[in-house]
Interface confidence: medium
């Protein structure tokens, strides 16, 4: 396994400005073993294993605002622990191709 | 190292029932994988019989299910095969093996003759 | 269940010849594929799981590749040892099922 925290770049949006700001944050990256089995075993139902947060925080940024909208405050999550395990499907995007964290609807970023 | 080793009898009479043993050394069949039992039929022909896992489940080819019983004995390392109401169709090689991402070990193989 | 077919039963070859084999499945089995060496005794060797990943001890003349439901075994660099009988195995649906074994003979 080759599970670990990284340093990642997040996109935050300020929708009624029509732009993003980055943000630099902590989150889980890397491999997790798996076994591809050719005799699947009833009683153990298949779990794909993936490299997720085992602990995290969540810290709070101010968001500047624009013309008519007053600045904001955005809270996200900072992964504190890795591990490999189920994908929480109630707090995390466990879809194959998901946009990712960097991404940003509209064409302006913000520092 | 892992060794598979088949045992039973190698000649059974029509509609009498087959009894194989398979002992494993080496690893212990309830820690992990499936513990397999294929055959081969005279023209080559390779077939998955059945499997029992280290949980104790058990999966059957539906093809025998209503003639085939899998078993094991944890406290010898054995698991068995039982095939009732053989046929001289069921002549052939019979292999146990054990199962995880590919079928990674390999009896020597016992050979079934059925004949009266 | 998945049928395995291995069209071409029989296939010779020389000493330091790469060849090829394969195998199709009756429907997709998304790599799900295992290939075996059965020796003439009737040992019997898994060589690669998941199409293409090496089983531990084994020559990395040997290479597996294939999607869908087509997949392919490849040896290089023939050696003595390598003329046996070959079998593909789908681990996708159960029942596993193997297709019929090609035999790589010695020209």
């Known amino acids: 396994n080759s599970c670990e925290l990284t340093n990642i770049t997040i996109a935050i949006e300020k929708e009624e400005c029509r732009f993003c700001i980055s943000i630099n944050t902590t989150w889980c990256a890397g491999y997790c073993y798996t076994r591809d089995l050719v005799y699947k075993d009833p009683a153990r139902p298949k779990i794909q294993k993936t490299c997720t947060f085992k602990e995290l925080v969540y810290e709070t940024v101010r968001v500047p605002g624009c013309a008519h909208h007053a600045d904001s405050l955005y809270t996200y999550p900072v992964a504190t622990q890795c591990h490999c395990g189920k994908c929480d499907s109630d707090s995390t995007d466990c879809t194959v191709r998901g946009l990712g964290p960097s991404y940003c609807s509209f064409g302006e970023m913000k520092e | 190292d892992v060794h598979l080793q088949e045992s039973g009898p190698g000649l059974v009479k029509p509609s009498q029932s087959l009894s194989l043993t398979c002992t494993v050394t080496?690893?212990?069949?309830?820690?992990?994988?499936?513990w397999n039992w294929i055959r081969q039929f005279p023209g080559n022909k390779l077939e998955w019989m059945g499997s029992?896992?280290?949980?104790?489940?058990?999966n059957y080819n539906p093809s025998l299910k209503s003639r085939i019983s899998i078993t094991r004995d944890t406290s010898r390392n054995q698991f068995f095969l039982q095939l009732n109401s053989v046929t001289t169709a069921d002549a052939g090689t019979y292999y146990c093996?054990?199962?995880?991402?590919?079928?990674?070990?390999w009896g020597q193989g016992t050979t079934l003759t059925v004949s009266s | 269940d998945i049928q395995m077919t291995q069209t071409t039963s029989s296939l010779s070859a020389s000493l330091g010849d790469r060849v090829t084999i394969s195998c199709r499945a009756s429907?997709?089995?998304?790599?799900?594929l295992s290939w075996y060496q059965q020796k003439p005794d009737g040992t019997i060797k898994l060589l690669i799981y998941?199409?293409?990943r090496l089983h531990s001890g084994v020559s990395s003349r040997f290479s597996g590749s294939g999607s869908g439901t087509d997949y392919s075994l490849t040896i290089s660099n023939l050696e003595q040892e390598d003329f046996a009988t070959y079998f593909c195995?789908?681990?996708?649906?159960?029942?596993?099922?193997f297709g019929g074994g090609t035999k790589l003979e010695i020209k």
């Open positions: 029992i896992f280290s949980s104790g489940s058990i």
């Open positions: 093996a054990r199962g995880g991402t590919g079928t990674d070990y």
């Open positions: 195995q789908q681990g996708h649906t159960l029942p596993p099922t």
């Open positions: 080496g690893f212990s069949i309830t820690s992990d994988y499936a």
């Open positions: 429907q997709d089995i998304s790599n799900y």
């Open positions: 998941y199409t293409s």
